[in-house]
């Protein structure tokens, strides 16, 4: 404890929850001679105190909303009050609790939206504030639409961003809103703190009135603009128009380009401001925005498409400074040596980028010029006149002209003459045996090393070996990487192995050269090898199709109604048995075979909704492995709870005799779901005979006043029956009794003679 709650004077930070204990000692600082006492300065707010002995404490509960951090300084003083140590900073961080409710900034909001506005684009924000810490759930607000009126075919036209309070259209709203059919809507919005996730969250509601207006704000047709235009800029290319005059137009470059060559004027005319370069960017998509005078968007942005038309302003380019090819000695005429692929930045598949190839020089011209030819359009080099001999000329250099319709470029090709590829790769083993792997072996694992050798000229295409799997792996689960120095092949796992689809694979490898074999030499059995891959089963648990299954039913559904279903599959193909776990209320049963879920008891939203249970899928046979998912049953409210008194009203009394008519206030409630702003109860006397003595009048949706009509009451208890109607569908009525006693009073309380048996009323009216 010594080190944790006491110690030397040094900078420290303490975190303390607000509103908790009214006082606590935080720490005891220990003085070193000649220090004998301590002094506290800074943001103490008369809450933080330090004792002479170094005890730092606070003397009343903290409030984060008043001050979230207290910056204090502690110094050690000697007997003369001189600072001998410090001052050192002491920081008190006040941690938040949820002690503030969210409040909408307005009790009513009004807004308008154009028909066909883009779904998801806010046209109105509701805003609530909560004094609690927004970095904690206490101050994290969650907005919801409680109801939309009217609601046509049960379709929501509006949605709210539950974090920002932004109201926008749904996809259906964007498509179906029509001012001719329905020009106005009302939404009731709720806000909760705790991110809406806690039963203990605080909430508030507000009302939103929305007008739907006609829309002429539409995207123009795509525009085509020739690149490198020499016309004077800016050039008008298209236009947009807002529905009403006075809009402020702007363009938004969603791509955040380093240069954005478009502008818009206050008429809505759109211009290109400088010549465009198709090779820099061949198309632009940007947005036209209309805002009101306060800079608030009036509607969704319009997408403007500009396509840049190509001109031939780029020469061909070579693939590299020198392109190297190999050709074997004694190769036959017409054999392909390689393809020179030049590039042109102009638009593909147009005359501007269509290339021609022509050999302009061969060096050396030994034994003659014109040994090579190039296909005019394809760029493929071929042997034209005769076979080559390495000892005569081991290397040729070609200059090739590549041209489009306006430009010419010279590219350089080096052709190395190599030994003939008359040796095939030979595997050191023809059979690499059996390999047994579990189906969950990691992707990327090297599972086998294979080796072939080739006696041709080293480090040429004649001796380089490429390994291919030619049989036994149609799924492409395996691959072979080759080490270019050693020609060693590493067999790796590229895709997960699967016992269920391929328990045994008979794999055949082929070893090949990138260079063609000399005429008359063919790959034979020596260039092939095999191995057998045996995959063992790893028993996997069944897999649910969803992590959470959700269903919605009315709380009054008949017993035996199907309320939902779940599905799972077993990777091994075993049958699955479904069961429920955590059905604490005994409301549900599941069909073990189909996964259908049925009600087996009356459901009750007021007991809690959604009702959450776990569903378990278990293999039938095998290892009986199982997996678990959630089933959430959302219960929709039915008006099935009559109104009742909100609290116990025994003990109401009037002092007898009444000097003037009196009254008392009572509150009603019920357990059903109340949209809008709470219940709307109506109140009346429970029987006609009471009307001579009593009167009941509504104060608001939940409170009413019971008044006496005269002063002539006997000294006894009266039981007044009150009828409370909830106005629901169907309307439910509760008859409640308010016991009211008229009694002799002493100092404002009922006087009871000794021995009186009934309870003494405690509330005077």
């Amino acid at each position: 404890q010594e080190g944790k709650f006491s110690g030397p004077l040094k900078p420290m930070t303490f975190s303390i929850y607000e509103g908790q204990e009214p006082s606590q000692i935080i720490f005891q600082f220990k003085a070193n001679p000649p220090a004998v006492t301590f002094e506290l300065t800074g943001e103490t707010d008369n809450i933080f105190v330090i004792e002479r002995e170094g005890l730092l404490y606070y003397n009343r509960a903290l409030d984060r909303e008043t001050r979230s951090t207290h910056n204090l300084q502690v110094a050690a003083l000697d007997a003369n009050g001189i600072i001998v140590e410090g001052p050192v900073p002491i920081t008190i961080k006040v941690k938040d609790i949820n002690d503030n409710r969210p409040t909408f900034l307005q009790s009513k909001y009004e807004g308008s939206v154009r028909q066909n506005s883009r779904p998801g684009k806010p046209f109105l924000y509701v805003n609530a504030t909560d004094l609690d810490d927004p970095a904690t759930p206490n101050g994290q607000l969650y907005y919801q639409i409680v109801i939309q009126l009217p609601m046509i075919n049960n379709v929501m036209y509006f949605q709210i961003n539950n974090k920002t309070g932004a109201i926008s259209l749904t996809r259906e709203g964007s498509q179906e809103l029509n001012p001719a059919k329905n020009p106005s809507y009302n939404l009731v919005i709720s806000v909760k703190d705790m991110g809406g996730q806690s039963e203990n969250s605080f909430s508030d509601t507000t009302s939103v009135d929305i007008i739907v207006t006609e829309n002429i704000w539409k995207a123009p047709k795509p525009v085509e603009m020739v690149e490198n235009s020499t016309d004077p800029h800016p050039i008008k290319i298209t236009q947009v128009r807002w529905n009403d005059p006075g809009a402020q137009y702007s363009l938004v470059d969603k791509e955040k380009l380093p240069r954005f060559p478009f502008s818009i004027d206050q008429e809505g005319d759109i211009y290109v401001t400088q010549p465009l370069d198709r090779e820099e960017k061949d198309a632009y998509v940007f947005y036209a925005v209309a805002k009101d005078e306060y800079g608030k968007p009036l509607s969704y942005p319009l997408e403007i498409h500009v396509k840049v038309k190509d001109i031939n302003d780029n020469p061909p380019t070579c693939p590299s400074p020198v392109t190297v090819f190999e050709v074997q000695e004694n190769e036959r005429l017409g054999n392909s040596i390689g393809t020179l692929t030049a590039h042109d930045r102009d638009e593909e598949n147009t005359a501007n980028s269509f290339l021609n190839y022509r050999i302009v020089e061969q060096t050396p011209k030994l034994p003659m010029d014109g040994l090579f030819l190039i296909q005019t359009y394809a760029g493929m080099l071929q042997l034209a006149k005769q076979s080559l001999k390495k000892q005569d000329t081991p290397q040729y250099n070609l200059t090739i002209e590549v041209s489009d319709k306006d430009f010419k470029t010279l590219c350089f090709v080096q052709i190395n003459v190599i030994d003939i590829n008359d040796q095939i790769p030979i595997f050191e083993k023809s059979d690499y045996g059996n390999l047994t792997l579990a189906e969950d072996t990691n992707i990327g694992s090297t599972i086998l090393t294979i080796q072939a050798t080739d006696a041709d000229e080293p480090f040429t295409g004649s001796s380089k070996i490429l390994y291919h799997i030619i049989k036994g792996d149609s799924e492409g689960r395996l691959g072979v990487d080759t080490d270019p120095h050693t020609n060693t092949g590493y067999v790796i796992i590229k895709k997960p192995l699967d016992f269920e689809t391929a328990a045994v694979s008979n794999i055949v490898f082929k070893a090949e050269n990138p260079e063609p074999l000399v005429f008359g030499v063919k790959y034979n059995a020596s260039s092939f090898a095999k191995f057998t891959l045996i995959v063992t089963d790893v028993n996997e648990a069944p897999q649910f199709s969803q992590h959470v299954f959700q269903a919605k039913v009315s709380e009054d559904v008949a017993i035996g109604t199907k309320v939902g279903n779940v599905t799972a599959k077993d990777p091994e193909g075993l049958d699955i048995s479904y069961s429920l776990r955590g059905d604490t209320r005994g409301w549900l049963k599941i069909d073990h075979v189909t996964g259908e879920i049925f009600s087996v008891a009356p459901l009750d939203r007021e007991a809690g909704s959604p009702y959450r249970v776990q569903v378990v899928a278990t293999e039938v046979g095998g290892s009986s492995l199982s997996s678990v998912s959630e089933f959430h049953l959302i219960l929709m409210d039915v008006n099935d709870n009559p109104p009742r008194l909100a609290k116990d009203y025994t003990g109401l009394f009037f002092c007898h005799p009444l000097s003037a008519p009196g009254s008392l206030i009572f509150e009603a409630t019920d357990d059903d779901q109340h949209l809008f702003r709470g219940p709307h109860f109506t109140f009346s006397l429970g029987s006609g005979s009471l009307q001579n003595d009593w009167e009941v009048s509504k104060i608001n949706g939940t409170h009413a006043r019971l008044s006496t009509r005269h002063t002539e009451f006997e000294e006894r208890e009266y039981v007044v029956l009150i009828r409370i109607n909830d106005g629901g569908r169907p309307p439910l009525e509760g008859i409640v009794s308010l016991p009211v006693t008229f009694c002799s009073c002493v100092e404002g309380s009922c006087f009871r003679p000794a021995g009186h048996q009934t309870g003494i009323p405690t509330v005077g009216m």
């Epitope: 404890q1 204990e21 606590q24 000692i25 008369n46 404490y57 003397n59």
Partner: nanobody, 114 residues
Framework: EVQLLESGGGLVQPGGSLRLSCAAS????????MGWYRQAPGKEREFVAA???????WYADSVKGRATISRDNAKNTVYLQLNSLRPEDTAVYYC????????WGQGTQVTVSS
Amino acid sequence: EVQLLESGGGLVQPGGSLRLSCAASGGTVSGYAMGWYRQAPGKEREFVAAINSGGPTWYADSVKGRATISRDNAKNTVYLQLNSLRPEDTAVYYCRRYDDYDSWGQGTQVTVSS
């Protein structure tokens, strides 16, 4: 305003033990830091021990190992157990609630003498 009433003091021989009690009325000890202080004749009042609502305790070096502070929130009482008493422990012992009124008791006399 809370009233703090100390009891349990008296005359005790050196080496003996004593348990002081501090009962609160008109207020609570629950949630508050509570402390014991003492004042010997002719000297300044000095800190003896303190306890938080959650349990951590502090002691003056002069009583460390011989004193134990504890609390019973249900009884609204704080205790100070003093063992191996010495003549220099003779003083009036005061109970304190660390609050914004800085509430103190009237004190109880402890005399250690043979």
